[in-house]
């Protein structure tokens, strides 16, 4: 996170760390919790390390330097990245993870809420983004979870800073024209929190932008809302019945 | 399965025109920004131009900078290159590539995946 | 512009053999934007490795890439009679666009 600032225990309970084990360990992506077993994050994360066994999540953490190797870790029990994801473009940025053992709720661990399907009518003014990514374009995991308010830009708005790619119904937008607070690297899969009628809600999974905190050059998200039947449809034909956070 | 397919290559007077045609098909053509690359006989690869998945932005080599205009109709699934007052150094096979743009650590990547077999453009009087 | 030049000119090898491919920029490149392609006689390019370490689709993980900033690597760490060919490195980081000048690998 560029421009952000250091968050508190239980501020942000659904942020996990998606880590891998192979000869040493280290934080690549983030993820957000929203069930007992069910992590969503970006299919990003995965090109290149698909085996489920090299990947720890931490849950209810706020500080990296504090995990040990007694630190307890989720493993994980499946990987389903959406099926029209492709590692040769930027669309279908999503996936979900399926963990081998339900996680307990607590007031430092516990999911965000989902938004409705194809919400396009809500209004978000009161938005942020957590993550222990780079704090600047060439610079290095943070140990304390970073937040960071960013203001939604509408997606004509980001279709015109983004002239080279094409900008889907799919995504969501946000960023400062003057740029100086965004997403960065080890943030991606993330979560884009917004706060309506006092409950959060997860608008968005951290997914790409060009550097980090330019001038112009707004964050991209994947779009929960334009998923939630994607998200139903896994999460319920895996577990027989829904487990999700859904909005009251 | 991807394909790309450039026409309308051939033997041309110096001063004159062209115009070559790529005809893509197998994936999302409107998703993807595409360009041409040409490679003089033998000789290594230049890259010539690119246009914009929507074709409002495009970008030139600085030796067909004003010369030649890259343009799609995405209703066709059709990449262009108009070629005006060409000259003997613009003798090149030309292909057309699509330019994918993945994700990676939440910057995107940039490459030609997919190439055309190429059409020879012959400037020479 | 970004120039690219790639070491050396040509390759002289037997299969089975070693081959390392150089590639230097003449300004920062992020690994990202830094392909690798295989073209033989006749042919067009072939995407072998795209930001700068990660293979395309359908090719044999006797090539590898690697490099940072600068400096960047193709290998193929054994070589085989289909291998033969030009190898060139590309940058799509900043405008123009730009190809090294090739290395071609023969056959001792």
């Known amino acids: 996170i560029v421009g952000g600032t250091n968050s508190s225990w239980g501020e942000w309970p659904w942020q996990v760390s998606l880590q891998v084990k192979l000869t040493a360990q280290r934080h690549l992506c983030g993820g957000s919790l929203i069930g007992h077993q069910w992590v969503l994050t970006a299919a990003h994360c995965f090109d290149g390390l698909p085996l489920q066994d090299v990947w720890r999540i931490y849950s209810g953490i706020l500080n990296l330097s504090d995990i040990t190797k007694d630190t307890p870790f989720s493993q994980i029990k499946e990987i389903i990245i959406h099926q029209n994801y492709k590692v040769s473009e930027g669309n279908h940025d999503i996936a979900l993870i399926k963990l081998q053992a339900p996680l307990n709720y607590t007031e430092f661990q516990k999911p965000i809420c989902l938004p409705s399907k194809g919400d396009t009518s809500t209004i978000y003014t009161n938005c942020w983004v957590t993550g222990w990514g780079f704090s600047k374009e060439k610079g290095e995991i943070q140990n304390i979870l970073q937040k960071v308010n960013i203001p939604l830009v509408t997606n004509e708005e980001c279709q015109k800073r983004y002239q080279d790619y094409k900008i889907t119904q799919r995504m969501v937008c946000a960023g400062y024209k003057e740029g100086g607070k965004d997403a960065c690297k080890g943030d991606s899969g993330g979560p884009l929190v917004c706060k309506h009628n006092g409950m959060w809600r997860l608008v968005g999974i951290t997914s790409w932008g060009e550097g980090c905190a330019r001038r112009e050059q707004p964050g991209v998200y994947t779009k929960v809302a334009e998923y939630m039947d994607w998200i139903l449809e896994k999460t319920q034909s895996s577990d027989g019945k829904a487990q999700m956070q859904s909005p009251a | 399965e991807v394909q790309l397919l450039e026409s309308g290559g051939g033997l041309v007077q110096p001063g004159g025109s062209l115009r070559l045609s790529c005809a893509a098909s197998?994936?999302?053509?409107?998703?993807?920004?595409m360009t041409w690359v040409r490679q003089a006989p033998g000789k290594g690869l230049e890259w010539v131009s690119y246009?914009?998945?929507?074709?409002?932005?495009?970008i030139y080599a600085d030796s067909v900078k004003g010369r030649f205009t890259i343009s799609r109709d995405n209703s066709k699934n059709t990449l262009y290159l108009q070629m005006n007052s060409l000259r003997a150094e613009d003798t090149a096979v030309y292909y057309c590539?699509?330019?994918?743009?993945?994700?990676?650590?939440?910057?995107?990547?940039?490459?030609?995946?997919?190439w055309g077999q190429g059409t020879l453009v012959t400037v020479s009087s | 512009d970004i120039q690219m030049t790639q070491s050396p000119g040509t390759l002289s090898l037997s299969p089975g053999e070693r081959a390392t491919l150089s590639c230097r920029t003449s300004q920062f490149v992020n690994s990202n934007y830094l392909a690798w392609y295989q073209q033989t006689p006749g042919q067009a390019p072939r995407l072998l490795i795209y930001g700068a370490s990660s293979r395309a689709t359908g090719i044999p993980d006797r090539f590898s890439g690697t490099g940072y900033g600068t400096d960047f690597t193709l290998t193929i760490s054994r070589l085989e009679p289909e291998d033969y060919g030009t190898y060139y490195c590309q940058q799509s980081s900043r405008t123009p666009w730009t190809f090294g000048q090739g290395t071609r690998v023969e056959i001792k």
């Open positions: 197998g994936f999302t053509f409107s998703h993807y920004l």
């Open positions: 590539a699509s330019v994918a743009r993945g994700i990676a650590a939440r910057s995107r990547t940039s490459y030609f995946n997919q």
């Open positions: 246009i914009s998945p929507s074709g409002g932005h495009t």
